[in-house]
């Protein structure tokens, strides 16, 4: 992508596509970390083994992808969850059905300029599986305007249900458009 | 995307966005082809009718998208599955629940340099539908560093459950970022 | 992304990445609008509050994203649905089970050059939830060749089931690749 030009005058600085910040992170076994019951837990990621990489100043540190350059980024993640029979409200036995179990993924932005983390993307699903073991993915992806220094993380409702066995099932990435 | 330059000296070769390899393939009716029960079946695709296209040396041949240029590609697919009542383990009747039915999509990379196909992306979901006909999509998408000559295909757990009626329900694509 | 050049001769016009048309729209409360029972309802969107934006001549007007420049666009949307127990066929009580409830999202293109709207992407899922409240997202994303003036909208099977409470749960976007 270039501009038409008829003289070699100085051009605005654009990052060539090959030099654009980008990362694809893959799941690794999570170390259990204490956190409050209703608080979402942050996942940590593999950043340079197998299919995982960070490139062009995109940096991964302490569960965060750190944005090196302001611009519009496409951010995506898939989390595969798995569990056993869920305790969903059985309306045949109980008058007032229980709130069903659920699984939730949130891609969160933390900015130095703003004290409160911002939820960029949320995928949430009730899970009412009446038999045996269940497994299913939640996929998220969208474009956001980010600032240099913004940090991105992926939070989940229950870290113990995340399938961390395969890098192709649970992952997180971003690239400058 | 251009670099700042103050003299017309030779620049590194970058592929302008308009010339980047890209493809969007759509589902077509699959011909039943013999394959083993637990082996994932590869789908074949429409590459130039309706919404389907290949561009800028991206080539589709014999179920494979062939990568014409090394770089970072965003790869995506949606497979819509459909079936009838599934045989999921009923824990009320059986002490040891059956393994549930499941649907799986894998985007696979085959490289000349590596004998074993690599699973880039997997979406897998247990299906426990206790009544009537069911249908649901699995969506996948992520970025990968690919080499010239790498070949991509989409495999599914049961080709007979894929909805191949509509090009907007089941598709596969990739583009150089 | 630039072409190799050794002289400052006129180049083809390419849109630099920073100047490419792009938009990320987020859900807002929908005003009930009469529409036929089996007709899909179009959603309207927030285009400049919170995380929502339109950029570089991409325009949002009257439920439509209007494409300002021909090219290949990545288009995506997530719709989060929520509801109460669905009326799916109960095979234990009734011999002939009812068709299950379903949720559907369609990203539709309207072109001046073609009278009939085209379904670019469809995500459709049967919903057979036997207990209490349910919620789940449908995600779609793919690349399409669009023409200047094409209009994109998102249609859903039942507007009353769309979760319009959070901008991170239900959204729609597109960018020129």
């Amino acid at each position: 992508v270039t501009e038409e030009r008829s003289a070699p005058s100085a051009q605005p600085v654009y990052t060539p596509s090959r030099d654009k910040p980008k990362a694809h992170l893959t799941i690794m076994r999570q170390t259990p970390v204490p956190h409050l019951k209703n608080e979402l837990a942050a996942l940590h990621w593999e950043n340079n083994l197998g299919m995982a990489f960070t490139k062009n100043r995109m940096n991964y540190t302490n569960k965060f992808l750190v944005i090196p350059e302001s611009g519009d980024y496409f951010i995506y993640s898939q989390i595969t969850f798995r569990g056993t029979t869920s305790e969903c409200g059985d309306i045949s036995r109980v008058r007032r059905p229980k709130k069903p179990d659920s699984i939730t993924v949130v891609i969160t932005k933390v900015a130095d300029s703003y004290p409160e983390p911002a939820h960029l993307l949320t995928g949430t699903k009730s899970v009412c599986e009446i038999s045996s073991n269940w497994f299913q993915p939640i996929y998220l992806g969208a474009m956001f305007s980010l600032e240099e220094g913004d940090r991105l993380m992926v939070n989940v409702s229950d870290i113990s249900l995340v399938d961390y066995t395969k890098e192709d099932k649970t992952f997180f990435g971003a690239f400058l458009i | 995307v251009t670099e700042e330059r103050s003299a017309p000296s030779a620049q590194p070769v970058y592929t302008p966005s308009r010339d980047k390899p890209k493809a969007h393939l759509t589902i077509m009716r699959q011909t039943p082809v013999p394959h083993l029960k637990n082996e994932l079946a590869a789908l074949h695709w429409e590459n130039n009718l309706g919404m389907a296209f290949t561009k800028n040396r991206m080539n589709y041949t014999n179920k494979f998208l062939v990568i014409p240029e090394s770089g970072d590609y965003f790869i995506y697919s949606q497979i819509t599955f459909r079936g009838t009542t599934s045989e999921c383990g009923d824990i009320s009747r059986v002490r040891r629940p059956k393994k549930p039915d499941s649907i799986t999509v894998v985007i696979t990379k085959v490289a000349d340099s590596y004998p074993e196909p690599a699973h880039l992306l997997t979406g897998t979901k247990s299906v426990c539908e206790i009544s009537s006909n069911w249908f649901q999509p699995i969506y996948l998408g992520a970025m990968f560093s690919l080499e010239e000559g790498d070949r991509l295909m989409v495999n599914v757990s049961d080709i007979s459950l894929v909805d191949y009626t509509k090009e907007d329900k089941t598709f596969f694509g990739a583009f150089l970022i | 992304v630039t072409e190799e050049r050794s002289a400052p001769s006129a180049q083809p016009v390419y849109t630099p990445s920073r100047d490419k048309p792009k938009a990320h729209l987020t859900i807002m409360r929908q005003t009930p609008v009469p529409h036929l029972k089996n007709e899909l309802a179009a959603l309207h969107w927030e285009n400049n509050l919170g995380m929502a934006f339109t950029k570089n001549r991409m325009n949002y007007t009257n439920k439509f994203l209007v494409i300002p420049e021909s090219g290949d666009y990545f288009i995506y949307s997530q719709i989060t649905f929520r509801g109460t127990t669905s009326e799916c066929g109960d095979i234990s009580r009734v011999r002939r089970p009812k068709k299950p409830d379903s949720i559907t999202v369609v990203i539709t293109k309207v072109a001046d050059s073609y009278p009939e709207p085209a379904h670019l992407l469809t995500g459709t899922k049967s919903v057979c939830e036997i207990s209490s409240n349910w919620f789940q997202p449908i995600y779609l994303g793919a690349m399409f060749s669009l023409e200047e003036g094409d209009r994109l909208m998102v249609n859903v099977s039942d507007i009353s089931l769309v979760d319009y409470t959070k901008e991170d749960k239900t959204f729609f976007g597109a960018f020129l690749i």
């Epitope: - | 077509m28 009716r29 699959q30 011909t31 039943p32 082809v33 013999p34 394959h35 083993l36 029960k37 082996e39 079946a41 459909r82 079936g83 009838t84 045989e87 006909n133 049961d158 080709i159 007979s160 459950l161 894929v162 191949y164 009626t165 509509k166 | -």
Partner: antibody, heavy 117, light 108 residues
């Protein structure tokens, strides 16, 4: 609830062309493929071929040279034509919905076609 | 093409008994892509089982399909009066789709 209603001539002479039509109601025609299957005392059940909403067809190789499955201009109903019939083509002809894939979960009422001089 | 042979040709049983129907393929049916149908005289066939063991919508659980490769079985655990009919198998593991010759289950 899907319903398939079929009609066409039931008595033909050898070398004539069999022509049958099937109308679908209760579901979206474009959501499925639609097939023709026949059943004769001699050969049992035999898949003839199928079609989708875009007019894409698949045929049994043993009949391919004589068969055409096509759509009405409105897309539904769909039709079967079998040329140069002989006594061996005497059978009950059914239209059916192909669902999930390559199996047939809803059938028309069937039409007995007799080929006799 | 794959040829399907069904046995026995006729099965004479009483209500409440167990029926076991066999379908043998001339070559391996890939991915267990085999279906079973039930047909009453003068009516169209009705889909019972696909994928060798998946029950179609609305089919009672006394019908069970099993098998893989070249040997497949349809079992009716306890025959009901309405189960006396002709049963056909169909393979869809390779083109063209083919059907077996049928097994008649009759009331003894």
């Amino acid at each position: 609830q899907v319903q398939l209603h079929q009609w066409g001539a039931g008595l033909l002479k050898p070398s004539e062309t069999l022509s049958l039509t099937c109308a679908v109601s209760g579901v979206s025609f474009s959501d499925y493929h639609w097939a023709w299957i026949r059943q004769s005392p001699g050969k049992g059940l035999e898949w003839i071929g199928d079609i989708n909403h875009r007019g894409r067809t698949n045929y049994n190789p043993s009949l391919k040279s004589r068969v055409t499955i096509s759509l009405d201009t409105s897309g539904n109903p769909f039709s079967l034509k079998l040329t140069s019939v002989t006594a061996a083509d005497t059978a009950v002809y059914y239209c059916a919905r192909d669902f999930p894939n390559w199996v047939f979960d809803s059938w028309g009422q069937g039409i007995l076609v007799t080929v006799s001089s | 093409e794959i040829v399907l042979s069904q046995s026995p040709g006729t099965l004479s049983l009483s209500p409440g008994e167990r029926a076991t129907l066999s379908c043998r393929a001339s070559q391996s049916v890939s991915s267990s892509f085999l279906a079973w149908y039930q047909q009453y005289p003068g009516q169209a066939p009705r889909l019972l089982i696909y994928g060798a063991s998946r029950r179609a919508t609305g089919i009672p659980d006394r019908f069970r399909g099993s098998g893989s490769g070249t040997d497949f079985t349809l079992t009716i655990s306890r025959l009901e009066p309405e189960d006396f009919a002709v049963y056909y198998c169909q393979q869809y593991g390779s083109s063209p789709l083919t059907f077996g010759g049928g097994t008649k289950v009759e009331n003894k």
